[in-house]
Interface confidence: medium
């Protein structure tokens, strides 16, 4: 289907590309001696980049620091030193640059202040960093300022004293709305959720915290949960892990009405050393990881129903090292329903798994064509592709980047990997899929940094090396053929590739430094590919592609979660611009229902290799430890529930007698005596 990648040799060489790129390569040398650089894009399609360089010398008692701030408004081709706008103040890099949501143009920089000061200091901009206003805070911030997703003028921050502070005017004035706060998050509609400790401290009260909500920025409050260990938001779901009465275990409770009513999730409870983790969530459902007892490094993935209450076991032995540790779980954003992760097998080897139907079934990644199985393979002809992600990076394997996919580069997935029976510690190669993970091909030999430009029209890569580099590689045909371009005669120690988030840009910035005997000088090269893709793409540059197609003869071919989607894809042979305004053209069509479109409802399960749901034997004639909306009530079910997000119509409708399931609510999580509303007067 696609040949092995080729570099430069008779591979559709682009005419005059060196001249075209040379004319569009812009160098900027930063005139300072900084030790670190951080870069942020301000707004979407604005071309504005802020670069903060910091230089720190730890002295015996205090540390001396200096920051410089640079601004570009042409996607990094030119930078202007704007340090004077922040009064040459040292900026605290651990807070980063707090960039406002959407295209608000808002930026907050948190400054370092001297020891005895009453509060912190921030520099605020609301005009894409053209101007900054210095503001002294009435508190010392513990976390970066958090913008409300709905209104970028509303900010919240935690102080080092665990106070919850809110601003309604983009940080000009602040008000402490609550003390003893451990964790705070914005919810929908400018709601703030937060946990508070009642007695000692956040750490000491873990499991005895209260979960509070304010819908009016701190005027009034409602306690929506007690005995809380932690909470999280995912999609339209609010989750809380709640301590059990009897022992030290805790359980997940879920709410879809901002905490007014709660239901106990049908998930295993966990002990002190275990954890829950929301791997992914959308408006339809959630992927939840439940840690195994003991220090195993793995757990189980469960997928929820549309209420977030009933969970189906999705994947066993899912690799997840520790709380806040490493997992390889990756949402492949270039194709609906696709996720990749790693499992830990009995022999402690790590294997990659992929699902194409939102966790319904997992399988190994297909072996790339024309590839050989490595030393990890028992059978040299049968093996699969294994993807390096966060865990490999944390283990300091030679993996410079996690897997990459972009919603507007339909079907494209790029990742480091090895071909065998398990992940190999040998130097990986880079593989690409153009169909959302169904098939793979080796794209580049050895580890590389990579990025997608122009919605997939160009892929750019740079070799991962500890020696200075001066070559960038690019492909205009989804990684089949590669051209090499020498972007500078003076090689640099490469530190990173930067392109505008969203993969719509045609500019790439290569960051690094040159080093002489005593000085290190930061430098960036921005390459604009607009002259490589000279013309705009036309209708005939695209071709139709049915996603998830595995059997073109079958009328259900391409059906995933009850519908199929056909996309227009750029032909590999077309060298043209999708353009900044490119919108993925897709045509959905509904599929007839089958049993695959339903999950088993509460009290039912699917025996292995069966498609029908049967009643769980251990629940027959028993009261169920299950709490719906915190009340005792009858739950009626026919054993099936449509999979969240499934759009099938007609076809099979699993009809069977409706059963009454008597339940006992065993959670006092919503003890009415503990429910109260308070005013902040």
């Amino acid at each position: 289907r696609r040949g092995a990648p080729a570099e430069d040799q008779d591979c559709g060489r682009l005419p005059d590309f060196i001249a075209k790129l040379t004319n569009n390569t812009h160098q900027h040398v930063f005139d300072d001696l900084s030790g670190s650089v951080s870069l942020s894009w301000v707004g979407d399609s604005t071309g504005v980049i802020l670069v903060l360089t910091t230089f720190q010398v730890p002295l015996v008692i205090v540390s001396f620091g200096q920051s410089k701030l640079y601004r570009s408004e042409d996607y990094g081709k030119n930078f202007k030193d704007i340090t004077n706008l922040i009064n040459n103040t040292f900026i605290r890099t651990e807070f980063g640059m707090a960039i406002g949501p959407e295209n608000s143009g808002k930026v907050i920089l948190t400054a370092e202040v001297s020891g005895g000061s009453r509060g912190g200091r921030v520099f605020r901009s609301s005009d894409f960093a053209k101007n900054f206003v210095q503001t002294d805070l009435p508190f010392h911030p513990l976390t970066q300022m958090m913008y409300s997703p709905q209104n970028s003028d509303y900010l919240l921050a935690l102080s080092t004293e665990n106070g919850l502070w809110v601003s309604k005017n983009f940080g000009e004035k602040w008000e402490e709305i609550h003390k003893a706060v451990c964790l705070a998050k914005w919810g929908p509609n400018n709601i703030i959720f937060f946990t508070t400790h009642v007695n000692g401290s956040c750490k000491a009260d873990l499991g005895a915290l209260e979960l509070w909500r304010t819908s009016d920025l701190g005027k009034t409050f409602k306690t929506i949960g007690v005995k809380i260990y932690s909470f999280g938001l995912g999609g339209r779901f609010l989750f809380a892990s709640v301590m059990a009465d009897k022992d030290t275990t805790r359980r997940i409770h879920v709410s879809t009405d901002q905490g007014d009513t709660w239901s106990m999730a049908q998930l295993p409870s966990v002990g002190q050393e275990q954890f829950y983790s929301i791997l992914a969530a959308n408006e339809d459902m959630v992927f939840m990881h439940v840690d195994e007892p003991g220090d195993t490094g793995f757990g189980t993935i469960f997928t929820s129903d549309d209420r977030g209450i009933v969970y189906s076991k999705s994947l066993d032995r899912h690799l997840y090292t520790t709380t806040g540790g490493e997992t390889d779980f990756t949402n492949v954003t270039s194709l609906r329903g696709v996720y990749i992760t790693s499992t830990l097998s009995e022999d402690n080897s790590i294997q990659s798994m992929i699902t194409f139907d939102q966790g319904g079934r997992w399988e190994h990644l297909r072996k790339p064509e024309n590839s050989k199985c490595d030393a990890t393979a028992k059978n040299k002809n049968e093996c699969s592709l294994h993807i390096h992600a966060s865990y490999s990076i944390s283990q300091k394997l030679n993996v410079p980047m996690a897997p990459l996919s972009e919603p507007n580069a339909v079907g494209i997935v790029i990742a480091h990997g090895s071909v065998g029976d398990a992940i190999s510690v040998m130097v990986p190669d880079v593989y690409i899929s153009d169909d959302g993970g169904y098939s793979w091909a080796k794209m580049l030999e050895g580890p590389h940094y990579y990025t997608i430009l122009d919605s997939g029209g160009i892929i750019v890569a740079i070799e991962h090396s500890n020696r200075p580099i001066n070559v960038i590689k690019f492909s205009t045909d989804e990684g089949q053929c590669w051209q090499s371009y020498v972007f500078t005669q003076e090689p640099i120690y490469f530190t990173g590739l930067a392109s505008e988030p969203g993969a719509r840009s045609m500019n790439i910035s290569i960051w690094g430094f040159t080093e002489s005997f005593i000085t290190r000088q930061w430098v960036s090269y921005t390459v604009d590919f607009k002259d490589i893709l000279e013309r705009n793409c036309e209708e005939d540059d695209y071709t139709t592609w049915l996603a998830h197609s595995t059997d073109p003869g079958d009328y259900k071919d391409g059906c995933i979660l009850g519908y199929k989607e056909q996309f227009l894809r750029l032909r590999k042979s077309s060298v043209c611009q999708n353009g900044r305004d490119y919108v993925v053209a897709k045509q959905p069509s509904v599929c007839p229902c089958s049993l695959e479109d339903f999950l088993c409802d509460f009290g039912y399960f699917r025996p292995e290799n069966a498609s029908e749901c049967v009643e769980q034997p251990e629940l027959k004639g028993h009261e169920l430890e299950f709490c719906l909306y915190g009340k005792e009530e009858h739950l009626t079910t026919n054993g099936y529930r449509k999979i969240p997000g499934d759009k099938c119509q007609g076809g099979m409708n699993p009809a069977r007698e409706v059963k009454d399931l008597k339940k006992k609510c065993t959670s006092n999580f919503l003890n009415p005596t503990k429910q109260n509303s308070k005013s902040n007067s």
Epitope: R535, E539, D540, T543, T544, L546, P552, Q566, Q587
Partner: antibody, heavy 126, light 107 residues
Framework: QVQLVQSGAEVKKPGASVKVSCKAS????????MHWVRQAPGQGLEWMGS????????NYAQKFQGRVTMTRDTSISTAYMELSRLRSDDTAVYYC???????????????????WGQGTTVTVSS | EIVMTQSPATLSVSPGERATLSCRAS??????LAWYQQKPGQAPRLLIY???TRATGIPARFSGSGSGTEFTLTISSLQSEDFAVYYC?????????FGGGTKVEIK
């Protein structure tokens, strides 16, 4: 209402060129692709190519490459198809047809041709 | 290019009867198929797009089905005005290609 009106019949000698016009009305001319299809006497339909009136970008069937030129004049909402080095087997009725596909979003790319001109008869004879 | 083959070349049907026309693609075109009707001396008219969706103003007796490589146009009860030539066209890829046509004549 939406319509495409083509120029009148032409009689040409072999080796000559013919230019057929197609005037659009009742819709935004630059918003939809224009296709050209021909039909020889007693034969089926044959797709010749298309033009994006918005950008002027063209796409020709391999068979006509080098002989056909499709252009447009957006100021008068008119598309043109010129066929050169005419042969006797180019005798046919030539149709312009609006593609349902939007030139801006690529939506409806796959929906066919919904409005057709009345056809222009081109006779090539010595 | 994708080759479209229609069968039969001619179909003789009595008024009021059902007519079934076939169209086969040399490779999968998913559901990207259009059907046209052409009467003598007239331009073609779009009947069906997306393999099964009727175009505006097309009577319900016309229906399309199929996906991938096999497609069918069905006229449930032939009226006198339905006797014409019918063409299928794949719109999955460029170049757009038509089938050779099926002539539906009065039996």
């Amino acid at each position: 209402q939406v319509q495409l009106v083509q120029s009148g019949a032409e009689v040409k000698k072999p080796g000559a060129s013919v230019k057929v016009s197609c005037k659009a009305s009742g819709y935004t001319f630059t918003g939809y692709y224009m296709h050209w299809v021909r039909q020889a006497p007693g034969q089926g339909l044959e797709w010749m190519g298309s033009i994006n009136p918005n950008s002027g970008g063209t796409n020709y069937a391999q068979k006509f490459q080098g002989r056909v030129t499709m252009t447009r004049d957006t100021s008068i909402s008119t598309a043109y198809m010129e066929l050169s080095r005419l042969r006797s087997d180019d005798t046919a009725v030539y149709y312009c047809a609006r593609g349902v596909g939007s030139t801006v979003t690529l939506a409806y790319y796959y929906y066919g041709m919904d409005v057709w001109g009345q056809g222009t008869t081109v006779t090539v004879s010595s | 290019e994708i080759v479209m083959t229609q069968s039969p070349a001619t179909l003789s049907v009595s008024p009021g009867e059902r007519a079934t026309l076939s169209c086969r693609a040399s490779q999968s075109v998913s559901s990207n198929l259009a059907w046209y009707q052409q009467k003598p001396g007239q331009a073609p008219r779009l009947l069906i797009y997306g393999a099964s969706t009727r175009a505006t103003g097309i009577p319900a007796r016309f229906s399309g089905s199929g996906s991938g490589t096999e497609f069918t146009l069905t006229i449930s009860s032939l009226q006198s005005e339905d006797f014409a030539v019918y063409y299928c066209q794949q719109v999955a890829n460029y170049p757009r290609t038509f089938g050779g046509g099926t002539k539906v004549e009065i039996k």
